[in-house]
Amino acid sequence: EEELQVIQPDKSVSVAAGESAILHCTVTSLIPVGPIQWFRGAGPARELIYNQKEGHFPRVTTVSESTKRENMDFSISISNITPADAGTYYCVKFRKGSPDTEFKSGAGTELSVRAKPSAPVVSGPAARATPQHTVSFTCESHGFSPRDITLKWFKNGNELSDFQTNVDPVGESVSYSIHSTAKVVLTREDVHSQVICEVAHVTLQGDPLRGTANLSETIRVPPTLEVTQQPVRAENQVNVTCQVRKFYPQRLQLTWLENGNVSRTETASTVTENKDGTYNWMSWLLVNVSAHRDDVKLTCQVEHDGQPAVSKSHDLKVSAHPKEQGSNTAAENTGSNERGSSDYKDDDDKHHHHHH
């Protein structure tokens, strides 16, 4: 009789995570009597995967009925494969004894696990940046195997080229992670823009995973200010407007100053949105010129998104309205020369208030 051989026909087997792996093993003889054991790895640190004689192996089932006579097929199926199961598996014949002793090993089957990368997570800078600045975005994806992976960056569908990518670890591992940093130059039109990180891997069957970041969370477009004097609305009143244009995000506080003194502070609420995603807002100041004997310097001061205030001033010539110079008004008596729309009862005045 020829000596027993342990045949593992597959040098390698590749399985998707979550599936079952079938590891084939046959022996060429019924002699010697003794059990089969499966190990992952070789040498003293090898890990027992299945022992025909004894033990509890909930994830392992035998492919054929090992109790049946003349059975020489000791293939096993391992359920719910994870990347941690990767390695070389050996089918080993033991000889009956006290204890059973190792008789012969198969050549081994290398199990590789195809694991999908996690959904890419794109994160931008902690603080907002303004147009013309370069900001960095990172993209991370984890848990994939094998190591080969492709990562691309896009801005509004246009592929970016300024990025650096690392796959870790460098050596052999059960699974891998990818980390990429892309540099993006912001423009004033980027409020509606998206940065996309796209990951392609053998497990995704040509349908890459994408992670996105909205530049609306990254960009700050500072406003432009324009202060103008409207025609006289009443004999003793001048309407001064401050147009705040093309800003983002909406968080904005406006303060009117008369000759450097705070006259009114308000927060942008009802704004108009431009096509590019930026906002416009307008504030009115009604100045009672009869309360002033000298020229008035009106300043529109805007604090946008917690940034240092920007301002625009306008000089109001009181001398242009001599009729009103000496008149007494309630405003003068109260020391107030500006009114918000809430101070007015008629719809026309409300309509001309700063909330548009």
Epitope: V33, Q52, E70
Partner: antibody
Framework: QVQLVQSGAEVKKPGASVKVSCKAS????????INWVRQAPGQGLEWIAM????????HYNQIFKDRATLTTDTSTSTAYMELRSLRSDDTAVYYC????????????WGRGTLVTVSS | DIVLTQSPDSLAVSLGERATINCRAS??????????IFWYQQKPGQPPKLLIY???NLDPGVPDRFSGSGSGTDFTLTISSLQAEDVAVYYC????????FGQGTKLEIK
């Protein structure tokens, strides 16, 4: 190591039934056949039947087919052999034996259970 | 059923001498290149012990003075140099079909 521990001696009257147990340890009970063999005093070995605990497949010696029933309890790794309609010539030592090579042989044996049938 | 017939029924051999026990099957016990014959030793008050499996393979732990041979229908158990502890009854068994035992051979010291 493999151990098969059998239940104690029984004395039965003719016509009665006996159920002998065999508790296995030291191996995975469902992976190997259990055989039952008997030996009358001063006589040779007589094979009764065998059972595969994994699926309760059984094979019986025709002589015992109508009177013997093999069962297993995998939760306790115990095999049972019940013999009905006992006669005096059923007096024997009843052995359970484990087949380690799936060759329908008997590699490891219990110590035996003496069943005496006497009126 | 396959019937196994052992010969002799009893045998007396001097210590250190060769002992030979035969087992003949009523039909071939070979299958797939294997001879499904097994030999057991039983000492008084003890269960049988497997000595030889598949006609010629020594069970682990069995002294190598025991050997088995034969094929088809005729098989032999040989003890090359009898020792005192070898006194026992020896049985052959087949499993080509459902198992049966030979009637046994009693081995004594001459």
């Amino acid at each position: 190591q493999v151990q098969l521990v059998q239940s104690g001696a029984e004395v039965k009257k003719p016509g009665a039934s006996v159920k002998v147990s065999c508790k296995a340890s030291g191996y995975t009970f469902t992976n190997y056949w259990i055989n039952w063999v008997r030996q009358a005093p001063g006589q040779g070995l007589e094979w009764i039947a065998m059972i595969d605990p994994s699926d309760s497949e059984t094979h019986y010696n025709q002589i015992f087919k109508d009177r013997a029933t093999l069962t297993t309890d995998t939760s306790t790794s115990t095999a049972y052999m019940e013999l009905r309609s006992l006669r005096s010539d059923d007096t024997a030592v009843y052995y359970c034996a484990m087949d380690y090579g799936s060759l329908y042989a008997m590699d490891y044996w219990g110590r035996g259970t003496l069943v005496t049938v006497s009126s | 059923d396959i019937v196994l017939t052992q010969s002799p029924d009893s045998l007396a051999v001097s210590l250190g001498e060769r002992a030979t026990i035969n087992c003949r099957a009523s039909k071939s016990v070979s299958s797939s290149g294997y001879n499904y014959i097994f030999w057991y030793q039983q000492k008084p008050g003890q269960p049988p012990k497997l000595l030889i499996y598949l006609a010629s393979n020594l069970d682990p732990g069995v002294p190598d003075r025991f050997s088995g041979s034969g094929s088809g229908t005729d098989f032999t158990l040989t003890i090359s140099s009898l020792q005192a502890e070898d006194v026992a009854v020896y049985y052959c068994q087949h499993s080509r079909e459902l198992p049966t035992f030979g009637q046994g051979t009693k081995l004594e010291i001459k």
